[in-house]
Structure formats: C-alpha cells, structure tokens
C-alpha cells in the first residue's frame, strides 16, 4: 500500500466539519517525486488539500471538510497516474445524529404467550446503525432501589418492541423498564417505568353467542336482542368489566357503546334497537376494579332482531 | 393477615345432607373467588367447586355436580358448600381456599372433616 | 378435561440433595401450572404460581419451570422440612384437576 488515510474521526455529527490526512510512503519509486495528491469525497473532486513533503520523506495531504452533509460517503485520495486517477487509499464517512430520547414507552402482560412485550417510539432517524435495549431489574418498592437485574432485552432489528419472557417475570412486584438507545454518536435513555406486570394485563374477550332459546322463556320483544357470551377461561378468574359495542350491518351508522357489564353477566338482553334489522356485535373486557389494558374487540356476532313484538310482556334492559 | 375457618363437618348418613361454612378475614372478600378442595383419606386433593367473587359463575367437578351447591354471602364474608345426596365416597377432609387472579389456592383453610357412613 | 400426571410418585433423598418432581398436563396450559407442599396433617400451602413466580415467604431453593405441558419442580438443596407431599395443579380452564402428588420421603 502506497498511501494511507486517517480521520480526525469516521463518523460525525451530520453537518460537521472532519479532516482527514492521506500520507504516501518514500519507497513508492514509481511515483513523482514531488507527486500532487488529490481528494474525492464520492464521485466530487474536493479542493482545499495542504501538501507537504515530511523529514522522513513522505509526503501528507491534509484536508478538511468544512460541512459533512452526507450521511454516507467514501472519501478517497488518489494520484494522478497517466490519464486516470490512481486512489491510494479510502475510508467510509459515516455521519448522523446521537440517539434521541426514546419516548412512548409502554408494556403489556400477554398471559396467553406469558411474557411482557413492550414498545416505544424511537424518535427521529439518526442515519447510524443505532441499537435499542429494553433493560429492566426487578424491585420490591416503587422501583427506588434496584433489585435483581434482568437480562437485557434486544428487539431484532429494525423493531421498536421486545418480549421479557415469563421466567425473568415476577407477578404482583414491581419491575423498573426503560430503553436505551446506543450509537456510535451517543446513548440515550427513555424515562422508567415502574409497574407490576399483573397491572398492564391485556385478556382475551369472550366470545359471543346466541342464546339458545329455551322453552320456557319468553322470546326477545322487537327491537331486542339475547345473546350470552363465553369469558376466556385463562382469565376467568381476573375481574373484569366488559362493554359491548353494536351497528346495523347496513348503513353507515357508527358504533353504539353499551356498558359497563360485570364479566359475570354471561348473558344480556339488549334492546332500543331497530326492529327486523341485522345487527353486528361486538364485546372486550379489562380488569377492574385493579389496572389492566382493554383487551382486542371479541368476533363479531350478527344477530337479527324481531320483526314485532310477542303479545306477553317480560322484564328487561332499555338502552 | 388473611384467615379462612371452615366449620359444619361431622358424621352423615349415606344420602343425608350437610351445609359446610367458610369464615373469611383480612381480605376484601367480595373480590375475590373461593373455591372448595377436598382430600379423602390417604389419597390426594380433588377440586370439588369454585364461585366467582359476586356468585355469578360456579363450576363444579363432575363428581359431586347435581349434588353439590357453592354459594356466598359477601356482606357476611362467608362461603358455603351444601351437600346432599352424600356417598361414602364424600368422605374426606373439605378445604376453602381463596383463589388468586390466576387460579391458584392460596391461602387455605385448616380444613373440616365430613364423613359419610351409616 | 385436562388431567395432569405426576412423577414420580414417591421418592427417597438425603437432606442436601436436589430434587425434582415432574407435571405433564394432557394438553397445553401455557403457564397456569401451581405447585403445593402438604405436611401430614396439615392444610396444603402455595409454592409456586403461574409456573415459575414463587409464593411471598417460600425460601429461594424452590424453583418451578416449564409450559405448555411439561413442568418441574425444584429443590436446590433439600432441607429436613422439606420432607413433604408436593402437588401440582392446572388452572388454565375448568374442571381444575391436581396432579397425584409426589411424597418426598427421607433416604
């Protein structure tokens, strides 16, 4: 190798100035003597080198770059050799941003897969390969004082949500999670959150389901619907409130809200609705009274209310 | 500090009936479900039935289904086990157990004996 | 239902040893797997929950693992009051059924 590149440094802040020195040895005797080393950064000739021959014998070119306002160029120094340019050496500039601050961080308790998934929101692109660990420990106060750690928790790439499995989970204690993100630029932490992963639990709805009719009950009045629905048994035993959502399947019609419900229930009549029309329904539960998410809205169940009402009259629910 | 007392146990005759109670305190009883576990003598536990935390749901073990009645009384933070159509079969020692959010017994009662033999 | 097989179901260890004690469920239960110790006598007494999580006030050397089927118990070092009988218990759906039990008897 004839000549050699050094950088003050190979990745920048975006926009910064970098200057870098191409050095060509003594012994490459088949070169000028005096030989003029140019600089390119990409495809673009750049101006500005400071040549000199040093006591030793070799020569130096020294540049900087007022503004690297590429995220990624390769920046070359090369002799003129004949009619073409011979490149001596070259480096990869890389420039970017430090990590911002990643926000939005949030968990939840997925008892069907039992783990905690977390996500947040990586901020702006830093134009830098930038790494995101979640990290977490475990603690028995209000994440204060910091108990076991847990093992660090890498997204693959590319995503912005990680999976603490179950056995590095303790329920109904407190965990303190944040984010870090890490480039070569700098690293950054989001704010910690501190929860118990029983208090971000995500449950599965029901499942609804027509009411079987049975013989000595009344048929539903016109404008009315029965069904019943089938809690998820993994849950069963999580308190929960539980809110049913409907809209005539035809129509623009928005979502009509009915609820809260005890989870317990298991069965409604709901009525006020418009008589021989297809309705599409819907049902999702939390936990409550204590913390949780909503869980997804359930299948729909398409059910068709009665055309008139039966002429004996029952108890049952106005909405 | 959480307590349950089971009480109501005793001889019956095959076919008679007998209701077991469950004292319940230092928890907010109406919140939670309760169930009833019970062990034959020498042999291992067998979970009989559970009732949510306001009476709504109440599953039982094939066992005793059609026999057996779970209920509760939350403003007297008490859990009841009827029995009727008794076997020798029911013989054992009956435990109440409060049930956690996920299913497990915890904490138990010291358990009552029912036995049933003529 | 969903029946639950235990094993072994005895077993004889020196104070000390490590033991374990296996739970095979019929079909998958993700991790509603419960662990109970029952002294001769007494009411039985929640080790385990939710497969791995351990109960407030049981000492650190027991350990539980596994889910969708199979599932383990663990002493690290088993202590004189230790000798026991141990269940296991599914709570995933209804009819909740205990394993047969694992007496741990002294060598």
């Known amino acids: 190798e004839c000549g050699h590149i050094s950088v003050s440094a190979p990745i920048v802040h975006l926009g910064d100035p970098i200057t870098a020195s191409c050095i060509i040895k003594q012994n490459c005797s088949h070169l000028d003597p005096e030989p003029q080393i140019l600089w390119r950064l990409g495809a673009e000739l750049q101006p500005g080198g400071r040549q000199q021959r040093l006591s030793d014998g070799t020569q130096e070119s020294i540049i900087t770059l007022p503004h690297l306002n590429h995220t990624q160029a390769f920046l070359s120094c090369a002799l003129n050799w004949g009619n073409s340019l011979q490149i001596l050496d070259q480096v990869e500039l890389r420039a970017g941003y430090p990590p911002a601050i990643p926000h939005n961080l949030s968990c939840l308790m997925n008892l069907t897969t039992s783990s905690l998934i977390c996500q947040w929101e990586p901020g702006p692109e830093t134009h830098l390969p930038t790494s995101f660990t979640l990290k977490s420990f475990k603690s028995r106060g209000n994440c204060q004082t910091q108990g076991d750690s847990i093992l660090d928790c890498v997204p693959k790439d590319g995503q912005s949500h990680c999976s603490i499995p179950r056995k590095h989970l303790l329920l109904y204690q407190n965990m303190g999670i944040w984010v870090q993100a890490e480039n070569a630029l700098g690293t950054s932490m989001s704010p910690q959150l501190c929860l118990d992963p029983m208090d971000v639990v995500k449950l599965e709805p029901p499942m609804l389901r027509t009411m079987d009719p049975s013989p000595e009950a009344a048929p539903p009045q016109a404008g009315c619907l029965q069904l019943s629905w089938e809690p998820w048994q993994p849950g069963l035993h999580i308190n929960q409130k539980c809110e049913l959502r409907h809209k005539p399947q035809r129509g623009e019609a928005s979502w009509a809200l009915v609820g809260p419900l005890p989870l317990e229930a298991l069965q409604y009549e709901l009525c006020g609705l418009l008589p021989a029309t297809a309705y599409t329904l819907q049902i999702r539960c939390i936990r409550w009274p204590l913390p949780g998410h909503w869980s997804d809205w359930s299948p729909s169940l398409e059910l068709r209310t009665t055309e008139r009402a039966p002429t004996h009259h029952h108890h049952h629910h106005h909405h | 500090e959480v307590q349950l007392l089971e009480s109501g146990g005793g001889l019956v005759q095959p076919g008679g009936s007998l209701r077991l109670s469950c004292a319940a305190s230092?928890?907010?009883?109406?919140?939670?479900?309760m169930g009833w576990v019970r062990q034959a003598p020498g042999k291992g536990l067998e979970w009989v039935s559970s009732?949510?935390?306001?009476?709504?749901?109440?599953p039982y073990a094939d066992s005793v289904k059609g026999r057996f009645t779970i209920s509760r009384d939350n403003s007297k933070n008490t859990l009841y086990l009827q029995m009727n159509s008794l076997r020798a079969e029911d013989t054992a020692v009956y435990y109440c157990?409060?049930?956690?959010?996920?299913?497990?017994?915890?904490?138990w009662g010291q358990g009552t004996l029912v036995t049933v033999s003529s | 239902d969903i029946q639950m097989t235990q094993s072994p179901s005895s077993l004889s260890a020196s104070v000390g040893d490590r033991v374990t004690i296996t739970c095979r469920a019929s079909q998958g239960i993700s991790s509603y797997l419960n662990w109970y110790q029952q002294k001769p006598g007494k009411a039985p007494k929640l080790l385990i929950y939710y497969a791995s999580n351990l109960q407030n006030g049981v000492p650190s050397r027991f350990s539980g693992s596994g889910s969708g089927t199979d599932f383990t118990l663990t002493i690290s070092s088993l202590q004189p009051e230790d000798f026991a009988t141990y269940y296991c218990?599914?709570?995933?759906?209804?009819?909740?059924?205990f394993g047969g039990g694992t007496k741990v008897e002294i060598k």
């Open positions: 230092g928890f907010t009883f109406s919140l939670y479900w």
């Open positions: 009732i949510s935390s306001s009476g709504g749901v109440t």
């Open positions: 157990a409060k049930l956690g959010e996920l299913g497990w017994f915890d904490p």
């Open positions: 218990q599914q709570s995933y759906s209804y009819p909740q059924k």
